[in-house]
Structure formats: C-alpha cells, structure tokens
C-alpha cells in the first residue's frame, strides 16, 4: 500500500471512529434497566452520561439531566472525563492530520514536516481511542458491579414494610452506546496506528544509500568531500540537491526528470 493511501485510509478510519466517540458520548443508552415486575406498567429505564430517561409501554418518555455533579458516582465522572479527553484529542488529531495529508499541499511544507505531523496525529488518535475504550469499559464494569450489588437490599425502619427502603431488582443490560463506544474507540486506535505506519514511509530514509548517476561532462570531475553523504539523503536539507556542478544527482531527482540526463 502506498504511503498516501495508508495515510488517507488512516485518516478516514480515525474520522469515522472519532464521529462514533462523539455519538457514544452524547447517547442516552449507556445502560438500560427493564422493570419487568412493575405492578402498574412496563417501565424501560435508560441512562447516559448526562441524563436519565424513562419510557413506558404507553409511549410516554421523559428524560432528565444530571444537573449536579454532587451525588453522582465517581465512576460516572471519570467516564465523562475520559470521553471528553478522547474527543478533545481527536479534534486536535484531525486538525493536525488535515495539514499532514500528503495529497494536500500547503505552502512549501516538506515531507519531513508532514511526517512529523502524521506521527503526531497518529499518536493523538491512538490516545483518543484508548481513552474511549477505557471509558466505556469502566462504565461496563460499573454496571456489572451494580448488577451483583443490587441483590443486597437496603432496609431502614422497624419491621413490616413501614418506612422501608430497598433496591428494586432490575435487569441491567449494556446500552447501545457501549458497543458504539467500543467500536469507535477501536477504529480511532486502528486509524492512529495506520497514520504512524504512514509516517515511516514519509520520513526520508536514513539507512539506505541512494544511487547516484553521472553523465559524461567532458571534463574531469573531482570528488567533493561529503558529497556521498549528501547523496545518501542524510538530513532533510540535502535531499534532492545537486552534488556536483558537473552532474551527479540523487535518485529522487532522476525520477522527477528521467529524460534530462545521459546515463553511464
């Protein structure tokens, strides 16, 4: 796969994943409870990170936001923070990656700068995806823990049923948002990895010596010290640079102008 394709695909995959992270964060169905033993009507309760909703069999639906930070589970606050951090990093990652795309030319930005930006955006996407996956997993763990704890009823008051408070037995299920979050986090992570892989292709190769071609100039050409080093592409400032006045060029220049020179 070409560098441009890998970078472009990584960007698109990350973009889809990022959109999914935003969608999951905003969704109300992080957890659902089915009050199957309700004596009045079938009640379907579902919660998100920001509000809780109830839907009845009659069609009545009502949602209420958690307007206070106090009294909310610490885990919920942690999940909120992780998802927001994931979104913020994703936004920065997208902005950086737009400028890093090889198919987009911005001023005289060279491949070395684009490589650094691609790597930066890739790392940002990876962290963003990890934040989302951890956030969703923490919430899922909270639900599982809650399910087992809900069997322990809390009682207060004296005997009988007067003044008693107890936990209602409900079926806790993972909401759609959890699955969206897991998939989205995974996609963002994969996209970030692809961007990092693409970065390697964009970086000037420091290890392989590049072929240098000469053309007959009709004069004796003295070997210039440091010229071979320059021709191997060490350092971005020496890339695509004429080594001799008389005629050696790097392989890159040859590919750009294949008919310009006579080959020995």
């Amino acid at each position: 796969m070409s560098v441009t394709a890998c970078q472009g695909l990584g960007f698109v995959v990350s973009l889809i994943g990022f959109a999914g992270i935003i969608a999951a964060t905003c969704m109300d169905q992080w957890s659902t409870q089915d009050l199957y033993n309700n004596p009045v009507t079938a009640v379907f309760n579902y919660q998100g990170l920001w509000r809780s909703c109830v839907r009845e069999s009659s069609g009545f639906t009502e949602c209420r936001g958690y307007f206070t930070l106090l009294g909310l589970p610490a885990m919920l606050q942690a999940v909120r923070a992780l998802m927001i951090v994931g979104i913020v990093l994703g936004v920065i990652g997208i902005l950086v990656s737009i400028f890093a795309l090889k198919c987009i030319r911005i001023g005289s930005m060279d491949d070395s700068a684009k490589a650094k930006m691609t790597l930066t955006s890739g790392i940002l996407f990876i962290i963003s995806g990890i934040c989302a996956i951890i956030g969703v997993s923490v919430f899922a763990n909270m639900l599982v823990t809650n399910f087992w704890m809900s069997t322990a009823n809390m009682y207060s008051g004296m005997g009988g049923m007067g003044g008693m408070v107890q936990t209602v037995q409900t079926r806790y299920t993972f909401g759609a948002a959890l699955f969206v979050g897991w998939v989205a986090g995974g996609l963002t992570l994969i996209g970030g990895v692809m961007m990092c892989i693409a970065c390697r292709g964009l970086t000037p190769d420091d290890s392989n010596f590049k072929a240098v071609s000469y053309h007959a100039s009709g004069q004796n050409v003295a070997y210039r010290p440091g010229g071979f080093k320059a021709s191997t592409g060490f350092g971005s400032n020496t890339r695509n640079k004429k080594i001799y006045d008389g005629g050696a060029r790097t392989e890159d220049d040859e590919q750009s102008h294949p008919t310009k020179y006579d080959y020995v």
Epitope: V40, T41, V54, E56, F60, L143, T167
Partner: nanobody, 121 residues
Framework: EVQVQESGGGLVQAGTSLRLSCAAS????????MGWYRQAPGKQRELVAG???????TYAHSVKERFTISRDNAKNTMYLQMNSLKSEDTAGYYC???????????????WGQGTLVTVSA
C-alpha cells in the same frame, strides 16, 4: 435518602369519602411509579391502585369504580380519592414509590409508615 409520608387516614362512616395523600421528600431525582397498597389485620398486602409517571393507572378489581388515583409529578405527591367506602376497606394504607437514584445508578423502592383507614358500618 428518599422518604414517603402518608396522610389523610382516619375513622369514617360506610358510604362516605376519604382522600389520602402521599408526599415524597429527600434527594429525589425522579419518581417513576407510585402506588397505594393496603394490609388488613391477618391478611396479605395487596395493591389498591398504582400510577406511572406518564399517568398510566391500575386498580384492584374490588375498588375499580370507587377509588381514583392521581399524582402531581412536580410536587412528587400522589393522591387516592376513596368514595363509597365499605367496611372491607378497613386496613393500613401504605404508599409505595419507585425512584431512580443517580448516586447509585439503581432503582429504590420506598415504603411509607402507613396510615390507618377504619370504616364503621
């Protein structure tokens, strides 16, 4: 902690009316279902009437035409209008509320201490 308190019980003549009230208080996020239960001496507890947040109601067969349940969601209050009372309606009437608690991410079922309704022949 969510609490519910009943009021309006007492001694009445058969054929008359009585209105019970149940008020919920405390750290309430949302009460979904509220209901009235009764328990006569030596008998099992039974649902008299229930009402959902959306206004769906249910009644025991024995009270269907005589009792009316209503609620005010804004005030977290429920009412039971009891007409044409009979001696068999004599019992302790208990308020029940199912409240969603965001602090624990669980439903809490809250019971009141009860109010006694005595119908004399």
């Amino acid at each position: 902690e969510v609490q519910v308190q009943e009021s309006g019980g007492g001694l009445v003549q058969a054929g008359t009316s009585l209105r019970l009230s149940c008020a919920a208080s405390g750290n309430i996020f949302r009460i979904d279902t509220m209901g009235w239960y009764r328990q006569a001496p030596g008998k099992q507890r039974e649902l008299v009437a229930g009402i959902s947040r959306g206004g769906t109601t249910t009644y025991a067969h024995s009270v269907k035409e005589r009792f009316t349940i209503s609620r005010d969601n804004a005030k977290n209050t429920m009412y039971l209008q009891m007409n044409s009372l009979k001696s068999e309606d004599t019992a302790g009437y208990y308020c029940n509320a199912q409240a969603w608690d965001p602090g624990t991410f669980r439903y809490l079922e809250v019971w009141g201490q009860g109010t006694l309704v005595t119908v004399s022949a």
